[in-house]
Every structure is written in C-alpha cells, then in structure tokens.
C-alpha cells in the first residue's frame, strides 16, 4: 500500500491525462483526486499507466467506494477491470448490457476469467433471466458460455434465446446440458418448414428423445455422421435399420467406419443381423436370424 | 540478460516512411513500458514517446504526434516506431528504451536505429 | 515543458580529481535521472531518482539536488569515466533531457 504523502508543488492533477504517466506511485496517490478520477475514468483506458500505476488507481476508487462502484464508473473502467478481483465485482450492481459489453471487450481474446465469470453471474442474477440480448453478447465473446452453465442455470433461458445460439457455442456441451436446451429450441423452432427446422435444430439433437428422432428420419433430411455421433446411446437404441437408413440418407455408408464406437456399437448389437445386411455396409454383430429378441424394458414397464 | 535489439540502419528518401523494431527478451515484456528517445547527429537526447505493451495505449511528446507511431506485437515481444513523411530533419538515432519500475528512469536502451534521410 | 541546462557544456579532469557538473531545471522537479554516453553507443542509465546509483555504477559516483538545482558528482576521476553526461526528468510532461556535459580525461 502506498504511504500517504502530501502531493509536491505544482503537481496537482487537473485533469487525468497523459502527463500523470511518469508520476510515481505516491505522487499519483498524492495528487490525484479519487472523485476526479471517478468522473474521468474514460481517460484512463487512453493513457499508457503501468501496472503499479494502475493498482494506485484502483486503491484511490476502493477508497472513494468501499460499497462497490457505481454503474457509471464501472461503464469505463477499461482496462482497471483486469485489475478487480471476483471479490469486487460481488459489490457491484451492473444492469446496463453496455456496462457488459465494455467490459467484456477488454477481456476479448483471453480465456473467461474468474473476474469475468463472476460479472457474468452479477449481471444475470440481476436481469432474473438469460434474455436473447444477453446470451448474443455473451457468445460473441465467448462461444463456449453457455456449456458453462449448469442444467439448472440453462432452464432460465428462454426459448426465444435460443435464436442467438451458433452451432460452435455447443461444441462443449455435454448431454445433459444439450437435455435442457433441446425442448427450448424445439419450441423456438417449431414453426419452421423441415429442411430449415433440420439446420437450426442439427445442433441441439444430442438432447432429443428416439420419438424425435423417429419423426425426423421421414423428413429427408440426410443427417451427417458428426450429428449422428453425438445423439442419445439411449435414444438411438430403438430405432430400426430402416429409420437410420432414412435419417441418414447418403451418410449411411459412414456408419462402417464407426462400427466400433458409442451409439453405432450399441445400436448395432441390438439390431437383427438380417436387416443390417440390408444396408450392404458389412455391419457385423448384430442377433443372428433364429434368435428371439425380448424387450425387457418393455416387461418391466408392465410389471 | 535483458536485450533491446534494433532493426539495422535505414537509408530513406524524403518524403517516405520507416518503421523500426526493437525486439525484446530476458523480461515479461507486457510488464514495463517501452520509450522512443532521438539523437541527432551526436547532440542531446529528445523523448518521442511511450507504449504500454499490454494495453497497446501510447503517450507523445507533443513534437511527435502525427510523425511518430508507437505499435507493439505481443507475440514476438517486439515494439516498433513508423516514422512517416520523412524529411532531413528526421535524420538521427532512434533509441527505444525500457522504463524503470516506478518511474526510475529508462534502465535499458536498445543499440540504436540510424536514420538518414537522403535523395 | 521543463528545460533542462547542464554546465559545463565541456570539461576535463585529471586523475583523481573530484568533479561536478549541474543541470538546472526552468521549473521545479522532484527527481532527476542521469545518463552516460559514450561515443558510438547507446546512452546507460547511470544515477536515477536523484541520488540512486544504476547496477555497476561505481561507488565514486554520486547524484544530489532538490527543487531546480541537480548535481552529478565524482569524487576521483578515472580514465573510463569520460564520457558525455545527460540529465533528464519526468516530473513535468513531456520528459526532457540536458543539453549534456562532455567530461573528458586530461
């Protein structure tokens, strides 16, 4: 912490600009004015302050604000940000999606930070929801945000959000997230003809049930291997040849080259060896012909 | 050991533009800010300006503004001047040099860029 | 901005003998920082915040002043110390540097 010293003759900042950048730090916390510098904050991001310089100015705004600072000061504070801890922002009350995108735009380019995460979290709590607005900003600057979020925390979103989402903001989302946001983009989408509602709905199917699925497979609409991948096991399961034939389409001859792995290799084991060479692939391990095939989900449902 | 290395010299027309590097390393280089100081012909020194590596936010000796441009890459650790519209006047060493911590003077000088503005 | 005069523009010294050169600013500054220069190199760091002497400065070296009034002081010249001498300060923007002293061996 700086010792408080009384500011040299003539050194007295007026106004905050370039000529504070070889102030020392006491003399930047002896001559500059914390309320000056809260009502010029937007100067600050202009003017080339080293890290030590910067750590001055933030002190002089704890002091000026224990509390937390205002939204307007927040608004610019540039690259000060990088200079709070998560602590720090829990004080804040940020509301303007402005405020939000400021901030976020020093960050650009860096991983999410804990500072970042937790402005994240203060700004949403604050608007009660996920809103469309929010979740565009968001995902500009951070495509993987909302695989981030809990499954909780994705059942706030609303359905008309769900417009903002690019296939690449759900390249880390594990099933369990794609389960809540699926119905929601269902919902969002139903009013599109098919082959548009297949594009926009490709990315959420790693959350449809087989009936879904099923529904799909009479579009048409030749469903790429990567989608294919990373639908349900369980949803898969039932599905027969011919349904994956039509869900597929061209792609069908894709699923040779993934016999072996999760859901092909599940789906294969419980299909008749018979309608598998239909598909003329050399798919093997499916039941052999004679064998009967009991559903025991089925008796355990009606037990 | 810290090491401020210049591009070499630079032979230029009047009227043209240069752009001079200074490559960094032994250090963090977003840590310390970088200074641009001319010398010409052996008489004393001139400051031009000053860049924060991290932020890219710049500071002009008011003599310099709209001569001198201070950019930095990050990537290569490397910061550099463009001098444009180049006249005899330009014709010097130019020296970037790092701050000191806390405003304790510039610690470490590059070689120097010798400039020389020529038809 | 801040003009900084250093006198002598030229001196000499034998060895062993104390030398000062000054630098006198046109306003007042809290510190000066000074550099050597040798011909055909870059100028070193050599006293900063006044009185503080850079890494490898020999001990024979010293720096005071306040105000306006700045001194660089050798209490006994030696061959390797001449050299060009500049002082420079930041307190005032834009930083500015003295015109030198050019200190040379008799």
């Known amino acids: 912490e700086v010792e408080k010293t009384a500011c040299p003759s003539g050194k007295k900042a007026r106004e905050i600009d370039e000529s504070l950048i070889f102030y020392k730090k006491w003399e930047l916390e002896a001559c500059v004015d914390a309320a000056l510098l809260a009502t010029q904050m937007d100067r600050v991001n202009a003017i080339p302050f080293t890290y030590e310089q910067l750590d001055v100015l933030k002190h002089k705004l704890d002091e000026l604000y224990p509390q937390g600072y205002p939204e307007s000061v927040i608004q610019h504070l540039g690259y000060l940000f990088l200079k709070m801890s998560p602590e720090d922002i829990r004080k804040w009350n940020v509301t303007s999606l402005e405020t939000l995108k400021a901030l976020l735009e020093v960050n650009k380019g860096h991983e999410m930070s804990p500072q970042v995460a937790t402005l994240i979290d203060r700004f949403v709590k604050g608007r009660g929801q996920l809103d469309k607005d929010t979740l565009d900003t968001l995902t500009a600057f951070y495509p993987g945000y909302l695989c981030s979020l809990s499954p909780e925390e994705l059942s706030s979103v609303p359905p008309s959000s769900i417009w903002a989402v690019r296939p690449q903001d759900l390249d880390t989302c594990d099933p369990r997230q794609l389960d809540v946001l699926y119905p929601k983009a269902r919902l969002a989408f139903q009013n599109m003809n098919g082959s548009e509602y297949f594009v926009k709905i490709q990315s959420f199917l790693g959350g449809a049930p087989t009936e879904d699925l099923k529904a799909l497979s009479q579009q048409n609409v030749s469903m790429d291997l990567a989608t294919f991948m990373k639908l349900r096991t369980d949803a898969v399961l039932p599905l027969t040849v011919a349904e994956v034939q039509k869900l597929l389409g061209p792609h069908v001859e894709g699923l040779k080259a993934e016999e072996r792995h999760r859901p092909v290799r599940d789906w294969i084991l419980r299909q008749r060896q018979d309608d598998l060479d239909t598909l003329g692939l050399g798919l093997q391990g499916g039941i052999p012909n004679g064998y009967l095939v009991l559903d025991l989900s089925m008796q355990e449902a009606l037990s | 050991e810290f090491q401020l290395q210049q591009s070499g010299p630079e032979l230029v027309k009047p009227g043209a533009s240069v752009k001079i590097s200074c490559k960094t390393s032994g250090y963090s280089f977003t840590d310390y800010n970088m200074n641009w100081v001319k010398q010409s012909n052996g008489k004393s020194l001139e400051w031009i300006g000053v860049i924060n590596p991290n932020y890219g936010t710049t500071g002009y000796n008011q003599k310099f503004k709209g001569k001198a441009t201070l950019t930095v890459d990050q990537s290569s650790s490397t910061a550099y001047m463009q001098l444009n519209s180049l006249t005899s006047e330009d014709s010097a060493v130019y020296y970037c040099?790092?701050?000191?911590?806390?405003?304790?003077?510039?610690?470490?000088w590059g070689h120097g860029t010798s400039v020389t503005v020529s038809s | 901005q801040i003009v900084l005069t250093q006198s002598p523009a030229i001196m000499s010294a034998s060895p062993g003998e104390k030398v000062t050169m000054t630098c006198s600013a046109s306003s007042s500054v809290n510190y000066m920082h000074w550099y050597q220069q040798k011909s055909g190199t870059s100028p070193k760091r050599w006293i900063y915040?006044?009185?503080k002497l850079a890494s490898g400065v020999p001990a024979r070296f010293s720096g005071s002043g306040s105000g306006t009034s700045y001194s660089l002081t050798i209490s006994s010249m030696e061959a390797e110390d001449a050299a060009t001498y500049y002082c420079?300060?930041?307190?005032?923007?834009?930083?500015?540097f003295g015109g030198g002293t050019k200190l040379e061996i008799k």
């Open positions: 420079q300060q930041w307190s005032s923007y834009p930083p500015t």
């Open positions: 915040d006044t009185s």
């Open positions: 040099a790092r701050g000191g911590y806390d405003g304790e003077a510039m610690d470490y």
